[in-house]
């Protein structure tokens, strides 16, 4: 099986043209597009890629380009207009040279004869460097997802095609398609490779049947399989959670709403370092896992397991990897403890009462929106968030 | 404004060789992409040639490659196309034209064009 990538190696999504031979197709890749089949152009120069002059982008070119990246025809071909204003017009009579500075940062251009790529060429400093970009849309805009997994790099597999986003079929589905997902979409390695009903079943049209990739492919595309078949139904739908999804749970406490806190990462359960766990942290947390508002931070524990996880939020944010966070990978969480959390849908904040003392019932509204009934407000000290 | 005028067109025989020049009356001849199009009797101008501003780079039409050469002489504000191996369909209008934004691939970034200078090839 392949060794997981390491963090800081994960592949982009844009088209990489190193899968060809040299000279056997063109140096060309297409990035800050929707999906790998649009975007601007970017040619390579020996070691270094540099976007396409703009002014030289005509539609022969952006026909070549498609077709050589296997994405079809083109649909649209276009110029990205300059981020700063274009050079000056042309100088006039008498004006002393600029051509020594201008010349050297000339862009490359590709400049093709006809649409067929073995008709083009990349002209070095053709174009001086006006910040005009070519950019095309091709007709087989291919994409990929995964979604209804509660982030980017978990959930539903799905790709975009003939202008339709569908399934892929759970047939042979295994960790090494999944790979491909994973890493195609910078979600790092494959944790699970899930059969149909993990997730929730997609609605349209299945595009993938028998996947069957090694794990090295580029793109998902580039496996062998088969068309989706008619008797492959969405209760079969193939799904993937790679490394860098993060999922949590509160363990130790009474039930699922209260404890310690503990986030799933690049393949192992993770304790949070508490130095930086603060109300609105808590509260982010409690409410995404469907547990209310975050009634208390209990003194941590020592880790019980790596604490690496560091998140800083502003209170708003739906999940804790919307926040801005931190994985350690060197150390472990210095001078800190676990973090931990109540949040006020536990069942422990419902049975704090004693038999000896009479009950006296107190209502708290903690956070202007949730009401937690506290019954002998003595037996248990609540500090409020 | 620059001027360009071409030189050297004339008659000759297949497989024969020319040369063509253009010079141009702008001291700021080296801040231009220069080119070669041609037009043919009853045909759409098309390109032939083209070289950047310090003549690092050059791009040739298809049916041009390995017989023409481009080239320029930036101290003499001098461009010139190097024509060999000729044949009759090379018979045409060669126009020299300066872009300044791009190599003059495309008639749309051109920004001057000479008045031409007539090549006949007879078989």
């Known amino acids: 099986h392949p060794s997981p990538a390491p963090p800081d190696q994960l592949n982009t999504s844009s088209a990489e043209s190193e899968l060809w031979e040299p000279g056997e197709r063109l140096p060309v890749r297409l990035t800050n597009g929707s999906s790998s089949c649009s975007g601007t152009v970017e040619v390579r120069l020996e070691a270094s890629w540099e976007p396409a002059c703009g002014a030289l982008w005509d539609s022969r070119a952006a026909e070549a380009v498609c077709r050589a990246l296997g994405c079809g025809g083109a649909e649209a071909a276009s110029q990205l207009a300059p981020p700063t204003p274009e050079l000056p017009p042309p100088p006039a009579a008498g004006n002393t040279s600029v051509a020594a500075n201008a010349t050297l940062a000339g862009a490359p251009a590709l400049l093709c004869s006809g649409a067929e790529w073995r008709l083009c060429e990349v002209v070095e400093h053709a174009c001086r460097s006006d910040g005009r970009r070519a950019r095309v849309t091709c007709a087989e805009n291919r994409a990929l997802r995964l979604v209804d997994g509660g982030g980017a790099c978990a959930g539903r597999v799905e790709m975009l095609e003939h202008g339709e986003w569908g399934s892929v079929c759970d047939d042979t589905w295994d960790l090494e398609d999944a790979h491909v997902v994973c890493r195609q979409l910078g979600c790092g390695w494959a944790v699970q490779a899930l059969p149909g009903l993990h997730f929730t079943p997609g609605r349209g049209p299945i595009h993938r049947d028998q996947v069957n990739c090694s794990g090295a492919e580029a793109y998902l595309w580039d496996c062998p399989g088969l068309p989706g078949q008619h008797y492959c139904g969405h209760k079969e739908d193939a799904g993937a959670v790679c490394s860098e999804h993060q999922s949590w749970r509160l363990t130790g406490g009474a039930d699922r709403c209260e404890g310690q806190v503990e986030v799933h990462f690049r393949g192992v359960w993770n304790t949070v370092c508490d130095s930086e766990w603060y109300p609105s942290e808590a509260k982010v947390l409690c409410q995404s896992l469907g547990c209310g508002t975050a009634v208390e931070r209990p003194k941590g524990l020592p880790h019980s397991l790596s604490g690496r996880m560091y998140y800083s939020c502003n209170g708003e944010e739906l999940t804790l990897s919307n926040c801005s966070w931190r994985f350690n990978n060197s150390n472990l969480c210095s001078q800190s403890l676990a973090a931990r959390v109540l949040c006020s849908a536990s069942r422990s904040l419902h049975n704090l009462s004693t038999p000896e003392v009479p009950a006296s019932v107190q209502t708290v509204t903690i956070e202007s929106s949730v009401t937690v009934k506290i019954e002998n407000k003595e037996s248990r000290e609540l500090m409020l968030l | 404004q620059v001027q360009l005028v071409e030189s050297g067109g004339g008659l000759v025989q297949a497989g024969g060789s020319l040369r063509l020049s253009c010079s141009a009356s702008e001291r700021t001849f080296s801040d231009y992409a220069l080119g070669w199009f041609r037009q043919a009797p009853g045909k759409e101008r098309e390109f032939v040639a083209a070289?950047?501003?310090?003549?690092?780079?050059?791009y040739y039409a298809d049916s041009v490659k390995g017989r023409f050469t481009i080239s320029r002489d930036n101290s003499k504000n001098t461009l010139y196309l190097q024509m060999n191996s000729l044949r009759a369909e090379d018979t045409a209008v060669y126009y020299c034209?300066?872009?300044?934004?791009?190599?003059?691939?495309?008639?749309?970034?051109?920004?001057?064009w000479g008045k031409g200078t007539l090549v006949t090839v007879s078989s």
């Open positions: 070289i950047n501003w310090v003549g690092g780079s050059t």
């Open positions: 034209v300066a872009s300044w934004g791009a190599m003059p691939v495309l008639t749309h970034v051109i920004n001057y």
